[in-house]
Interface confidence: low
Amino acid sequence: SEVEYRAEVGQNAYLPCFYTPAAPGNLVPVCWGKGACPVFECGNVVLRTDERDVNYWTSRYWLNGDFRKGDVSLTIENVTLADSGIYCCRIQIPGIMNDEKFNLKLVIKPAKVTPAPTRQRDFTAAFPRMLTTRGHGPAETQTLGSLPDINLTQISTLANELRDSRLANDLRDSGATIRIG
């Protein structure tokens, strides 16, 4: 069964996905797709990384964490009801049938009738660079709590402690993590 995440129309949705690279900078390709993970690859790819970089992304879909350290959590900006559904995070570990697949269910709720508080407006504006604040490198940025050392086949539910209080209430508090190597 998929882990469920919620967001309101007009907000940014956050879908957590992590792995621990065997060594810093020793990256594993990852794809994000709309729809449940198929046998191979991702269907309806919205974002893809390779061994170096994010090499494909589409409008409104971003990685905001330090993907070089394995934070490949997806942000979808300014969601609409049409963004509801299953999303696949596929960590493409070398070797036959070694991929780790995570299906995450996104539920979009209609926006509240009452005006959004200023904090929400700040959140939407700040979020695209939350973990990659210009002028601070990956080693210095505000970042998620350190990932536990777990085996490849283990999946851990993490409480993603975000130091920026403006963001904390807007993000879901669980995600999938694997360790490679």
């Epitope: 810093p24 900078g25 020793n26 990256l27 061994e51 170096r52 970089d53 994010v54 090499n55 992304w57 589409t58 409008s59 971003w62 990685l63 993907f67 070089r68 695209p128 660079r129 990659t132 210009r134 002028g135 490198g137 990956p138 080693a139 210095e140």
Partner: antibody, heavy 121, light 107 residues
Framework: EVQLVESGGGLVQPGGSLRLSCAAS????????IHWVRQAPGKGLEWVAD????????DYADSVKGRFTISADTSKNTAYLQMNSLRAEDTAVYYC??????????????WGQGTLVTVSS | DIQMTQSPSSLSASVGDRVTITCRAS??????VAWYQQKPGKAPKLLIY???FLYSGVPSRFSGSRSGTDFTLTISSLQPEDFATYYC?????????FGQGTKVEIK
């Protein structure tokens, strides 16, 4: 304070070589991409090459591919641009600049003061 | 390579004027566009990153926007220190490419 300081420029004959250095302070180059960007006299900016020091990944502009080599020594927190088979059209001020490895955010937030390379006989 | 076509190549304006510089990408670059200011004999300085984010320490009179593959740098009220050359840059793909520059001169 973040600083980038280039050195190694000068006058060289066509076909000659130069090695430029970019000494970084105030941050660890292992966490960033380091780029070289050049500007011919009275002209605009042209990206030359970049390196991601911790992964050793490099990219080059077609105009310098096979002639220039970018490298980095993380222990010295310094990036280098080895320029061989220099041509008159390589004459420019060469800047090193700091970028982020994620292409989506890879604007250059800190630049060195530049070093002039003149290729002339 | 992605071409960044910047216009105008130069403009004359007075202190207090609203100035707009545009850059058109030859293909989709998402929001991966930055704007820089350069003064004679100096290195460029980052003003705007990711199309519309104001870089730290840059005055709020500078702003950036995107409409498809068209990107705009606006200076809401030109100040004496703003007379310089401005460049756009796409960083969506390698190689990163710059516009040819816009020189903002005193009228």
């Amino acid at each position: 304070e973040v600083q980038l300081v280039e050195s190694g420029g000068g006058l060289v004959q066509p076909g000659g070589s130069l090695r430029l250095s970019c000494a970084a302070s105030g941050f660890n180059i292992s966490n960033y991409a380091i780029h070289w960007v050049r500007q011919a006299p009275g002209k605009g900016l042209e990206w030359v090459a970049d390196i991601t020091p911790d992964g050793g990944y490099t990219d080059y502009a077609d105009s310098v591919k096979g002639r220039f080599t970018i490298s980095a020594d993380t222990s010295k927190n310094t990036a280098y641009l080895q320029m061989n088979s220099l041509r008159a059209e390589d004459t420019a001020v060469y800047y090193c600049a700091r970028g982020y490895v994620y292409r989506m955010w890879d604007s250059f937030d800190y630049w060195g003061q530049g070093t002039l390379v003149t290729v002339s006989s | 390579d992605i071409q960044m076509t910047q216009s105008p190549s130069s403009l004359s304006a007075s202190v207090g004027d609203r100035v707009t510089i545009t850059c058109r990408a030859s293909q989709d670059v998402n929001t991966a566009v930055a704007w820089y200011q350069q003064k004679p004999g100096k290195a460029p300085k980052l003003l705007i990153y990711s199309a519309s984010f104001l870089y730290s320490g840059v005055p709020s009179r500078f702003s950036g926007s995107r409409s498809g593959t068209d990107f705009t740098l606006t200076i809401s009220s030109l100040q004496p220190e703003d007379f310089a050359t401005y460049y756009c840059q796409q960083h969506y793909t390698t190689p990163p490419t710059f516009g040819q520059g816009t020189k903002v001169e005193i009228k």
